[in-house]
């Protein structure tokens, strides 16, 4: 699910279609303020079809999406901006299969930022597209409070201080 100007969109088989269950308004939040919208142009452009999706060099392809694993380290907020500037977003994990793919491609055992942070506005862990985490699929170890952001390590999700510096994963 992707947030665009005034309506939440789904990328399905390369085309963007209005999602009936959500008419969203607004842009994405980072803990210290507001960032610009992720537009459907940015995020849907690359998905013509699951089979024909082309990933840029240095990006890995999986299930019709493209993934980029950083080598340097940044805070969650800086990582968030880095992905946006490259027409992508911090990793949103949809299921355990995707988690397994990510873990297989992580070449180290340290924490890695993903696109999930705690917002005290709604008192929930929220993915960068505005959707809440599915607690039936994922459990977050650690405190749920303001300035908490999520990092993965060995297929588990941990709550960490957003100002900590870790590697990160971008996705489109």
């Amino acid at each position: 699910l992707l947030v665009s100007q005034g309506v939440l969109l789904k990328c399905q088989k390369g085309s963007c279609s209005n999602a009936t269950q959500y008419e969203d308004t607004g842009d994405l939040k980072v803990n210290n303020g507001t960032r610009r919208n992720i537009s459907n142009k940015d995020l849907c452009a690359s998905r013509s079809a699951d089979q024909t999706v082309l990933c840029q060099s240095e990006w890995l392809k999986y299930q019709g999406k493209c993934y980029w694993f950083s080598n340097e380290m940044k805070s969650w907020s800086d990582s968030y901006v880095y992905c946006l500037e490259r027409k992508s977003h911090l990793l949103i994990i949809h299921d355990q299969l995707e988690m397994a793919f990510i873990q297989k491609n992580l070449r180290q055992l340290n924490y890695v930022w993903i696109g999930l942070n705690f917002t005290s506005l709604k008192m929930t862990w929220t993915w960068v597209d505005g959707s809440p985490i599915d607690s039936k699929i994922f459990f977050i170890k650690g405190p749920a409070k303001e300035n908490s952001c999520a990092a993965i390590k060995e297929s588990k999700i941990f709550s960490e201080t957003c100002s900590s510096v870790f590697k990160w994963i971008c996705q489109y």
């Epitope: 969203d24 308004t25 939040k29 506005l121 008192m123 505005g130 959707s131």
Partner: antibody
């Protein structure tokens, strides 16, 4: 869409449960608010329930009001009702990334 | 207890004129911009006009403009039209899942 029900005439000291029935919306990912409006008065936030199902209340509403939800409804239980509670009660859904309510029900009238 | 104060309580306006409504919160809204404006007409639920302090909701005419940050916010209606006769409310969103409405401003056309 959202539709409130359960509003009726009730005697002081009584209890009442209002229901907000949701259709076409994934309630599990929604932040849902209850707001009331006394006749000729302004809007007053009562409380809300977030996606994990945790409820939050205005300081004046704590104790007497309880918000809960199922997969398709959001309930507002009110106890120890007084004449001051006479109002139209609205349920409203917030947009995903803001506290702005972009979907409202038509309201249900409670008369104490 | 968060208090949101709206002024004035009522304002008269001529068609084509400008209306300014102020909204003050007793504490900072979330992210300094989590402030919404609604329009309500008798017998109807409120309608979202502006969110995040200054972003126009879908389908809302550009004559409505929101501004402000932190605790002080303003709604300006430029080139007022007959259809704008209504009561306007601001609403703040706060940490801890809290929300609060202003007392409302009635816009009367003369």
């Amino acid at each position: 869409s959202l539709e409130e029900s359960g509003g009726r005439l009730v005697t002081p000291g009584g209890s009442l449960t209002l229901t907000c029935t949701v259709s076409g919306i994934d309630l599990s990912s929604a932040y849902m608010n209850w707001v009331r409006q006394a006749p000729g008065k302004g809007l007053e936030w009562i409380g809300a329930i977030n996606s994990p199902g945790v409820a939050y209340y205005a300081s004046w509403a704590k104790g007497r009001f309880t918000i809960s939800r199922t997969s398709t409804t959001v309930d507002l239980k009110m106890t120890s009702l007084t004449t001051e509670d006479t109002a139209t009660y609205f349920c409203a859904r917030e947009a995903a990334t803001t506290s702005a309510n972009n979907l409202w029900g038509q309201g249900t009238l409670v008369t104490v | 207890q968060i208090v949101v104060t709206q002024t004035p309580a009522s304002v008269s306006a001529a068609v084509g004129g400008t209306v300014t409504i102020s909204c003050q919160s007793s504490q900072n809204v979330y992210g300094n911009n989590e402030l919404s404006w609604y329009q309500q007409k008798p017998g109807q639920p409120p309608k979202l006009l502006i969110y995040k302090a200054s972003t126009l909701a879908s389908g809302v005419p550009s004559r409505f403009k929101g501004s402000g940050s932190g605790t002080q916010f303003t709604l300006t209606i430029s080139g007022v039209q007959c259809d704008d006769a209504a009561t306007y409310y601001c609403q703040g969103g706060y940490s801890g899942g809290m929300r609060s409405f202003g007392g409302g401003t009635e816009v009367v056309l003369v």
